[in-house]
């Protein structure tokens, strides 16, 4: 025997209180598949979330994050504060990367500069808060009398951020 509810299309629900007839989803709710016994409440994009797509009777609202925040999680279920390149987010806010560490993203954490000497290379371009060092040829490969213009980067150990 076919379930009488199966004929209720998306955007409606099978109303048990009305002899299982198909009733439209009430305002601020939706059903995305046929045969639903109830409509789901629409997601509300509040606070640091902003509406990317309005809720309709057949599909949920979609949110993203307000400027200055980035999405995490499925369907942008979380928003985390952005920082600038050269910074990382702590509970006290955005803090500059400590010397010897960098972050080239607006999110995430600082990580240590590459230690060129571990690969037998020299530092071609110094690291900054925003950029890793650039390693060049090994000191032995340089022409006689020439030397690396910059001191080697510190060993690639975890940085210690102000917290």
């Amino acid at each position: 025997l076919q379930d009488p509810c199966s004929k209720c299309p998306a955007g409606t629900f099978c109303d048990n209180n009305r002899n299982q007839i198909c009733s439209p989803c009430p305002p601020n709710s939706f059903s995305s598949t046929s045969g639903q016994k109830a409509c789901d409440i629409c997601r509300q994009c509040k606070g640091v979330f902003r509406t990317r797509k309005e809720c309709s009777s057949t599909s949920n609202a979609e949110c993203d994050c307000t400027p200055g925040f980035h999405c995490l999680g499925a369907g942008c279920s979380m928003c985390e504060q952005d920082c600038k390149q050269g910074q990382e987010l702590t509970k006290k806010g955005c803090k500059d990367c400590c010397f010897g560490t960098f972050n080239d993203q607006k999110r995430g954490i600082c990580r240590p500069w590459t230690n060129c000497s571990l690969d037998g290379k020299s530092v071609l371009v110094n690291g900054t808060k925003e950029r890793d060092v650039v390693c060049g040829p090994s000191p032995a490969d340089l022409s006689p009398g020439a030397s690396s213009v910059t001191p080697p980067a510190p060993a690639r150990e975890p940085g210690h951020s102000p917290q």
Partner: antibody
Framework: QVQLVQSGAEVKKPGESLKISCKGS????????ISWVRQMPGKGLEWMGK????????NYSPSFQGQVTISADKSISTAYLQWSSLKASDTAMYYC?????????WGQGTLVTVSS | DIELTQPPSVSVAPGQTARISCSGD??????AHWYQQKPGQAPVVVIY???NRPSGIPERFSGSNSGNTATLTISGTQAEDEADYYC???????????FGGGTKLTVLG
Amino acid sequence: QVQLVQSGAEVKKPGESLKISCKGSGYSFSTYWISWVRQMPGKGLEWMGKIYPGDSYTNYSPSFQGQVTISADKSISTAYLQWSSLKASDTAMYYCARGYGIFDYWGQGTLVTVSS
Amino acid sequence: DIELTQPPSVSVAPGQTARISCSGDNIGDQYAHWYQQKPGQAPVVVIYQDKNRPSGIPERFSGSNSGNTATLTISGTQAEDEADYYCSTYTFVGFTTVFGGGTKLTVLG
């Protein structure tokens, strides 16, 4: 959509080596940290370490330093966890997760059984 | 490294409030996150950055964090909330993440 797909269950003998994988898709794999988390049978979650696939910088929990190696191949969006010599006490479920503090996506887990 | 301590188990009657604590030296100085894990499943974030609730997580879940204790509160606990709960924090000293030992929440009845 974002997914982390891990390699299948493994049954190994003590002393054998093993490398398990975690393939990311649906996002910029190179620019998000990947962490590995161990869960021994009936026990809690233990953070093992993390890798930044963009430059393969790794950082380990003191408890796991020297016990495992974490690596990544950004060209195929895959992170790895490996052992050179397994012990019975390595029997556990191993999860990869995206992130370093907030783990917003998790793999389905790889069950590793080490038994003679 | 910071150590996070949770009670091994908490029991609550349906509809009542469950509180799960997570204690660690000055944890209030760092963000605390909470994960729910049901049998055979990967963990899921239920609270992030002390008190923020991801969309899709019911409003009955809330969090706080100050001093030496972070707390996950579930108001009007339901049978489906029965699971293991883990707190975690990222510490900038040592560059590491730490999980608490986990708390098994049992919903009575």
